[in-house]
């Protein structure tokens, strides 16, 4: 899950609701910064590189952020 | 059911302040981006400013931009715009509006019915 | 700033397809979403990301977007369907909602 921070947060709305994982692109956890006060997670999917914005603290999300690091873990050597 | 109900207003002079609401319900308005978006009698839509789901990004339309504040009070489900030094060509219905929820392209799922603005002396 | 071209008027009979176009630089590299809105009435979302749909909007009405033009689709006209029509996209370079001038749908 890559780590990076454009000079402001990037969130306009955000969603309780995980995503497909087959339908991600890719996934970014933004953390706070002097630009921005919040953690950010970012949901690339594969339709034309929209962007959803998810919410850290939902339940969910977590959950699905686990799933995620999980299959990465299983794929790397 | 989702619902945006704008309110104040009304018929102002040039360089006076008046301030719009918009109360949201049927949905969890803290997790969504608002706008306000205008539309003056006879033309076509006109964005106006947006607002993130905790208020901490704000952009507007160059016109409206040192004049114009978009806020909100999720504590109360209302989003806000106060409007100072209006002119003219401020005259306008405005309509608030939900954001769809994607970052990367801002769109319009829910609008108000809208509130007439008419700046005139 | 993005600029997004409509022509202002387009006539068409019942029961025939109606197309709105919409130019603008390279909009196939964008999201392009149409609304619809009928005289006194707030505007209503019909095609969002190019070519989804809303729940509760016939499938009479389609999109699709490449190189500069974007297209608005109504397929089997009906007098109903008579309304302004905008196109709308987020120009990310400016933080900027764009909207079109919008087009006037007439069933004759």
């Known amino acids: 899950v890559p780590l990076s921070r454009t000079v402001r947060c990037t969130c306009i709305s955000i969603s309780n609701q995980p995503v497909n994982p087959r339908s991600l692109e890719k996934l970014e956890i933004i953390p706070a910064s002097q630009f921005c006060p919040r953690v950010e997670i970012i949901a690339t999917m594969k339709k034309k590189g929209e962007k959803r914005c998810l919410n850290p603290e939902s339940k969910a999300i977590k959950n699905l952020l686990k799933a995620v690091s999980k299959e990465r873990s299983k794929r790397s050597p | 059911q989702v619902q945006l109900v704008e309110s104040g207003g009304g018929v102002v002079q040039p360089g006076r302040s008046l301030r719009l609401s918009c109360a949201a319900s049927g949905f969890t308005f803290s997790s969504y981006g608002m706008h306000w978006v205008r539309q003056a009698p006879g033309k076509g839509l006109e964005w106006v400013a947006v607002i993130s789901y905790d208020g901490s990004i704000k952009y507007y339309a160059d016109s409206v931009k040192g004049r114009f504040t978009i806020s909100r009070d999720n504590s109360r489900n209302t989003l806000y715009l106060q409007m100072n030094s209006l002119r003219p060509e401020d005259t306008a219905v405005y309509y608030c509006?939900?954001?769809?929820?994607?970052?990367?392209?801002?769109?319009?799922?829910?609008w108000g019915q809208g509130t007439m603005v008419t700046v005139s002396s | 700033s993005y600029v997004l071209t409509q022509p202002p008027s387009v006539s068409v009979a019942p029961g025939k397809t109606a197309r709105i176009t919409c130019g603008g630089n390279?909009?196939?590299?964008?999201?392009v979403h149409w609304y619809q809105q009928k005289p006194g009435q707030a505007p209503v979302l019909v095609i969002y990301?190019?070519?989804d749909r809303p729940s509760g909007i016939p499938e009479r009405f389609s999109g699709s977007n490449s190189g500069n033009t974007a297209t608005l689709t109504i397929s089997r006209v009906e007098a109903g369907d008579e309304a302004d029509y905008y196109c709308q996209v987020w120009d990310s370079s400016s933080d900027h909602v764009v909207f079109g001038g919008g087009t006037k749908v007439t069933v004759l």
């Open positions: 990301y190019d070519s």
């Open positions: 390279n909009i196939g590299s964008k999201s």
């Open positions: 509006a939900k954001d769809w929820g994607f970052s990367g392209s801002l769109t319009f799922d829910y």
